[in-house]
């Protein structure tokens, strides 16, 4: 079977790490230095990716697999296979064309990347704000105001009797 297949298409027998060399009557040749082929049957080897500048090498290139890059400290990867490096900002900021800017009031960012997002609107779920939001943190929603009003039905045990004139906390 191997002999038959190789007569039909000799290139199909070339394993990863090699290419089908047209200059040598289509025999399989190992990839030249700093190139790779990650699958069999290739007619060329691909040039290894070089991680330069803001990119740094996460995995070295080999004859059967490309190099993998990540970003130097202070930057993070964007795109498939870390095709770009973007500057980090602090929590509570977002990256704009003019650099890192604080989140506007009513928005937050709890990461070093990405954009500022609006605080959760607790009232949309019929809840109240338990903890106020900041530039770095979203609001924390608590029980609905109705749950806090006197006489409201609740699955929790009733609070101890209070002196007249004192409303619940």
């Amino acid at each position: 079977f191997e002999r038959t297949r190789s007569l039909q298409d000799p290139c199909s027998n070339c394993p990863a790490g090699t290419f089908c060399d047209n200059n040598r009557n289509q025999i399989c040749s190992p990839c030249p230095p700093n190139s790779f082929s990650s699958a069999g049957g290739q007619r060329t080897c691909d040039i290894c990716r070089q991680c330069k500048g803001v990119f740094r090498t996460r995995k070295e290139c080999s004859s059967t697999s490309n190099a993998e890059c990540d970003c130097t400290p202070g930057f993070h990867c964007l795109g498939a296979g870390c095709s770009m490096c973007e500057q980090d900002c602090k929590q509570g900021q977002e990256l704009t064309k003019k650099g890192c800017k604080d989140c506007c009031f009513g928005t937050f960012n709890d990461q070093k990347r990405g954009i500022c997002r609006p605080w959760t609107n607790c009232s949309l779920d019929g809840k109240s704000v338990l903890v106020n939001g900041t530039k770095e943190r979203d609001v924390v929603c608590g029980p609905s105001p109705a749950d806090l009003s006197p006489g409201a039905s609740s699955v929790t045990p009733p609070a101890p009797a209070r002196e007249p004139g004192h409303s619940p906390q």
């Epitope: 990839c31 230095p33 080999s62 004859s63």
Partner: nanobody, 111 residues
Amino acid sequence: AVQLVESGGGLVQPGGSLRLSCAASGNISSIRVISWYRQGSGKQRELVAWFAWDNVAHYVDSVKGRFTISRDNTKKTTYLQMNSLKLEDTDVYYCNSGDSWGQGTQVTVSS
């Protein structure tokens, strides 16, 4: 240029072993990839085993687990240890680096 000379071929019975040698001379500092090929009469030259540029040894499926490529840089020599030889391993074996080829050494597996 690099000059390559193979040796170690011969007649062996099925299941036997041979060790081929490939001695390099000339501008050997340029050698990054070195390979063993084999070719029978009227057949395509076939890659068998090689040291890639990253110094990793590779083998084609038909010889994996039976053949081992190694090298002795002090002797400027690359070896192909061939164990559990089969009738279909009969071929002329060539050493290659870049555009340089050895003259070949005949390996015959026969009972």
